[in-house]
């Protein structure tokens, strides 16, 4: 769902952990659209709390009303709380905005568990720690919800950054980023650096800590090391990509690559976990268990339910394997791989940890809606959503959590034939995109 597994996500501190930082390689990528180099005003503009989403501060209406808005590349509506709710400290008050326009239309968004509904309108929107512009954008004013807002999460709305095809109630409702690009000179590109803490944060620390950066209109080179590798956006709805191979500690899962993308593979900042299709998940867990077989963990741990706790500072990262996903490259028969560490896929849980313990949840889970590259993946990398060139870039994040032995990696090129065959073609029916639920 949008919650539970689909939202909950973790935040953290910025900056390379343990003072480790990889040397920059020469940039080999061809010129990117938009401003390049430094976006100082946008760096560190995201915050978040473990498992509960990364959010950016936005203002809505005239005079401006400040709200924290969850950054979600897995949906396409800009929707904000617009009525009192026990979990909201504040909400959008349309009656106080002189620039609010009612579209006299409702919107209802059901998830597998939970839902939100509201009224559509438009208003002036800006991002204080973003580009210095104000745009008129569609806003869904959430008047009723169930299991959508999260107690203590500190965000009051959601910014869907995907494409119009998956907007509700239909694709005629222009998403925020489309409006931003249309109404300004901002290039059609944004990038995300999500910085996982790597250790549990208490509420005070989490609220005060930096969670990362959303760079609107370009790429900030201070946020990554090495070079950017790009994979094509297969279709502009979700940010859909194609995975061509999966390895656990260098061991190929040896599955038909169509299985990896059944029924799609997407990059989704609004999902906590790396979610894998059932068959792939089972094979991956079997391989991860085999790689860490000196230890045995409870069944519930592998289901993402039970927590495993180690005495503070003694987590045996070395017994857990790295996970590599090979993505279709920009050149025919060429792929590249992104590799994450257990520091990304074992998610620290702050609620139960004491000063004596570090507790973790296994953040790889099963999906019935395809592969979802959620925070577990994104926290290892600086991810560029290059909409103008219909591609997504990955580079090693300057803030990813690692140790002295291993680091997340983006490497290539690799020769991979028949990659087009790895994409799954969803049978087109009226209901094919109806299930918003991401449980």
């Amino acid at each position: 769902t949008h919650l539970g597994i689909r939202l909950p996500l973790r935040s953290g501190l910025a900056g390379p952990p343990l003072g480790l930082r990889l040397p920059r390689e020469t940039d080999e990528e061809s010129e990117e659209p938009g401003r390049r180099g430094s976006f100082v005003e946008m760096v560190d503009n995201l915050r978040g709390k473990s498992g509960q989403g990364y959010y950016v501060e936005m203002t809505v209406g005239s005079p401006p009303q400040t709200l924290n808005i969850l950054v979600d590349t897995g949906s396409s509506n800009f929707a904000v709380g617009a009525a009192p709710h026990p979990f909201l400290h504040r909400y959008y008050q349309r009656q106080l905005s002189s620039t609010y326009r009612d579209l006299r239309k409702g919107v209802y968004v059901p998830y597998t568990q939970g839902k939100w509904e509201g009224e559509l309108g438009t208003d002036l929107v800006s991002i204080p720690h973003g580009p210095n512009v104000t745009v008129r954008a569609n806003i869904a004013a959430i008047t009723e919800s169930d299991k959508f807002f999260i107690n203590g999460s500190n965000w009051e709305g959601i910014l869907g950054l995907a494409y119009a095809e998956i907007a509700r109630p239909d694709d005629s409702l222009e998403p925020f980023f489309d409006s931003l690009v249309k109404q300004t000179h901002i290039p059609n590109i944004f990038s995300l650096q999500l910085c996982g803490a790597g250790f549990p944060l208490n509420q005070t620390e989490a609220l005060a800590s930096v969670g990362g950066s959303m760079i609107i209109g370009g790429i900030d080179h201070s946020l990554y090391t090495g070079r950017l590798w790009y994979t094509p956006i297969r279709r502009e709805w979700y940010y859909e990509v194609i995975i061509v191979r999966v390895e656990i500690n260098g061991q190929d899962l040896k599955m038909d690559c169509k299985e990896y993308n059944y029924d799609k593979s997407i990059v989704d900042s609004g999902t906590t976990n790396l979610r894998l299709p059932k068959k792939v998940f089972e094979a991956a867990v079997k391989s991860i268990k085999a790689a860490s077989s000196t230890e045995k963990f409870p069944d519930g741990f592998w289901l993402g339910e039970q927590l495993v706790c180690w005495q503070a500072g003694t987590t045996p990262w070395n017994i857990f394997p790295v996970i590599s996903l090979y993505l279709m490259g920009e050149v025919t028969n060429q792929s590249f791989r992104i590799t994450i560490l257990p520091q990304q896929y074992l998610r620290p849980v702050e609620d139960v940890a004491t000063s004596q313990d570090d507790c973790y949840k296994f953040a790889v889970s099963q999906s019935s809606t395809g592969t979802v590259m959620g925070a577990v993946i994104m926290e290892g990398f600086y991810v560029v959503f290059d909409r103008a060139r219909k591609r997504i870039g990955f580079a090693v994040s300057a803030c990813h959590v690692h140790d002295e032995f291993r680091t997340a990696a983006v490497e290539g090129p690799f020769v991979t034939a028949d990659m087009e065959d790895c994409g799954y073609n969803i049978p087109q029916t009226d209901e094919s995109t109806l299930m918003t639920g991401r449980a």
């Epitope: 000196t294 045995k296 409870p298 069944d299 519930g300 339910e305 039970q306 495993v308 609620d351």
Partner: antibody
Framework: QLQLQESGPGLVKPSETLSLTCTVS??????????WGWIRQPPGKGLEWIGM???????WYNPSLKSRVTISVDTSKNQFSLKLSSVTAADTAVYYC????????????WGRGTLVTVSS | EIVLTQSPATLSLSPGERATLSCRAS??????LAWYQQKPGQAPRLLIY???KRATGIPARFSGSGSGTDFTLTISSLEPEDFAVYYC??????????FGGGTKVEIK
């Protein structure tokens, strides 16, 4: 059917090391489905988890006892053992060995227990 | 650290009566909770695991319910052999080291 039996001295002097062995009969200690654990119960009090071991030798200990506890396994003898060093009167208890099953979470089979008294 | 609080400390009932024992966790443990029975001079015995599943050989009069923070062990009709001490244990955090303080069910 599988049974567990604790053995070892019933009296240990303060500052010495308490040593107990649990013998598993009717099944293999090398099963990949179980951990093997030690729990103790001071007279008239509740249960305290001491630690557990996997047949591979991987161990988990109660942090409050970790500096004094060693649990080991001997698969050839189908036994696992507990050593608790520098004992005091507070370590006087009935010591139980148990199997950790049901998804490697619950103590689904217990030995009868053995009372160890720490006294000079 | 998750703390398990059992209540009441002692429950005085007669054979044939219904016993309701409570175990409250200081924070959610999902359904990862067990109940054990310990008779005088004996080792504990697993009764219920995963909050509501009866262990092998446990009579149907024993049932467990609850999830999150509040759990209940119910003995529908007390038999003479049911008078004992009952402990709950959470394994939401693993290794499985947290037990409740126990509830003694005694004959009235």
């Amino acid at each position: 059917q599988l049974q567990l039996q604790e053995s070892g001295p019933g009296l240990v002097k303060p500052s010495e090391t308490l040593s107990l062995t649990c013998t598993v009969s009717g099944g293999s200690i090398s099963s990949s489905s179980y951990y093997w654990g030690w729990i103790r119960q001071p007279p008239g009090k509740g249960l305290e988890w001491i630690g557990m071991i996997y047949y591979s030798g991987s161990t988990w200990y109660n942090p409050s006892l970790k500096s004094r506890v060693t649990i080991s396994v001997d698969t050839s003898k189908n036994q696992f053992s507990l050593k608790l060093s520098s004992v005091t009167a507070a370590d006087t208890a009935v010591y139980y060995c148990a199997r950790v099953g049901h998804g490697i979470s619950y103590f689904d089979l217990w030995g009868r227990g053995t009372l160890v008294t720490v006294s000079s | 650290e998750i703390v398990l609080t059992q209540s009441p400390a002692t429950l005085s009932l007669s054979p044939g009566e219904r016993a309701t024992l409570s175990c409250r966790a200081s924070q959610s443990v999902s359904s990862y909770l067990a109940w054990y029975q310990q008779k005088p001079g004996q080792a504990p015995r697993l009764l219920i695991y995963d909050a509501s599943k009866r262990a092998t050989g446990i009579p149907a009069r024993f049932s467990g319910s609850g999830s999150g923070t509040d759990f209940t062990l119910t003995i529908s009709s007390l038999e003479p052999e049911d008078f004992a001490v009952y402990y709950c244990q959470q394994v939401y955090t693993w290794p499985p080291r947290t037990f409740g303080g126990g509830t003694k069910v005694e004959i009235k």
